[in-house]
């Protein structure tokens, strides 16, 4: 009997009520592997979740977060509210970055400004709540005749949670 069930492909289940016949998964359910005795209920993306990929007979739905929220956890199991740049999300809500720290993302916590002097450089552009300082050449490099190219501000591309 087990051998008959192992022949049932993904998208079907082995129907015990019908002599191990492979029956298609009912609507709003799926089986991603063969030989299943039941189909799993499709995930529903409701509330702060929105559908990224519809459920099919062989794969579950995939959810994303609506605007103003971001995913956390494997398969986006949770949506957490965004903050503004220059803020961090604490357990009590969004809070402005303290002086000397910044956050250029809508998530995460505020990061200390770069200390340019540790690498023998000087501050070219001061930091803000939203942006890190920009380090320039060391003071010794700024003597007359020394060329100095202005480095770009440290932009970050939108990040992703570790999923």
């Amino acid at each position: 009997l087990q051998d008959l069930c192992s022949n049932c492909p993904a998208g079907t289940f082995c129907d015990n009520n019908r002599s191990q016949i492979c029956s298609p998964c009912p609507p709003n359910s799926f089986s991603s592997a063969g030989g299943q005795r039941t189909c799993d209920i499709c995930r529903q993306c409701k509330g702060v979740f929105k559908t990224r990929k519809e459920c099919s007979s062989t794969s579950n739905a995939e959810c994303d977060c609506i605007s103003g929220y971001h995913c956390l956890g494997a398969e986006c199991s949770m949506c957490e509210q965004d903050c503004k740049q220059g803020q961090e999300l604490t357990k009590k809500g969004c809070k402005d970055c303290c002086f000397g720290t910044f956050n250029d993302q809508k998530r995460g916590i505020c990061r200390p400004w770069t200390n340019c002097s540790l690498d023998g450089k000087s501050v070219l552009v001061n930091g803000t709540k939203e942006r890190d300082v920009v380090c320039g050449p060391s003071p010794a490099d700024l003597s007359p005749g020394a060329s100095s190219a202005t480095p770009p501000a440290p932009a970050r591309e939108p990040g992703h949670s570790p999923q």
Partner: antibody
């Protein structure tokens, strides 16, 4: 897929310097901060610092300030960690690890580690 | 700088539940991350931001955090779970932002 591949093991004498490399692939190197963490034999994990590969901005643990320098070469998607004035207690496995897009979360991808042995 | 305190070891029989604690002042106000470290292997992130699992980490691994203690829970432990586990936080207010606990060796009995 994301990969961080580090340079091979090194044996150094006390007082010397070592430079460990970490080549990134499978993602946009300049978009994600890189951290360095070490583990001495029989000891725990110890955070050393980070570098923003886009700007070159760094932050070092106070313990290593003045001895560590983190740099990068964006043209070859490689981060470097140089530790100078080596002592025997710097013998450790050194890891690079990627921060996944924002500060305050866990480090999601790690290099395989580079063993640095400091011995006279 | 901020200090995280872990027990040196935790022993548990296969199939049982292991709980590894990480203590710190008002740690419940911080986001705690957990790494599994096996000999001669790189650390692996198993829980981030107190309770979230990266893809590929089994559901029997979970985390919680409140007050002065964060906890990593491994249910139905297997021989392959034997490893060192480290908690970690970021402390932007200090001169040492990245802080790890001392690590806990999970010993599977039998």
């Amino acid at each position: 897929q994301v990969q961080l591949v580090q340079s091979g093991a090194e044996v150094k004498k006390p007082g010397a310097s070592v430079k460990v490399s970490c080549k990134a692939s499978g993602y946009t190197f300049t978009g994600y901060y890189m951290h360095w963490v070490r583990q001495a034999p029989g000891q725990g994990l110890e955070w050393m610092g980070w570098i923003n590969p886009n700007s070159g901005g760094t932050n070092y643990a106070q313990k290593f300030q003045g001895r560590v320098t983190m740099t990068r070469d964006t043209s070859i998607s490689t981060a470097y960690m140089e530790l100078s004035r080596l002592r025997s207690d710097d013998t450790a496995v050194y890891y690079c690890a990627r921060e996944p897009g924002y500060y305050g979360t866990g480090l999601d991808y790690w290099g395989q580690g580079t063993l640095v042995t400091v011995s006279s | 700088s901020y200090v995280l305190t872990q027990p040196p070891s935790v022993s548990v029989a296969p199939g049982e539940t292991a709980r590894i604690t990480c203590g710190g002042d008002d740690i419940g106000d911080k986001r705690v991350h957990w790494y599994q470290k096996k000999p001669d292997q790189a650390p692996v992130l198993v829980v981030y931001e107190d309770r979230y699992r990266p893809s590929g980490i089994p559901e029997r691994i979970s985390g919680s955090n409140s007050g002065n203690t964060a906890t990593l829970t491994l249910s139905r432990v297997e021989a392959g779970d034997e490893a060192d586990y480290y908690c970690q936080v970021w402390d932007s207010s200090s001169d040492h932002p990245g802080v790890f606990g001392g690590g806990t060796q999970l010993i599977i009995l039998g």
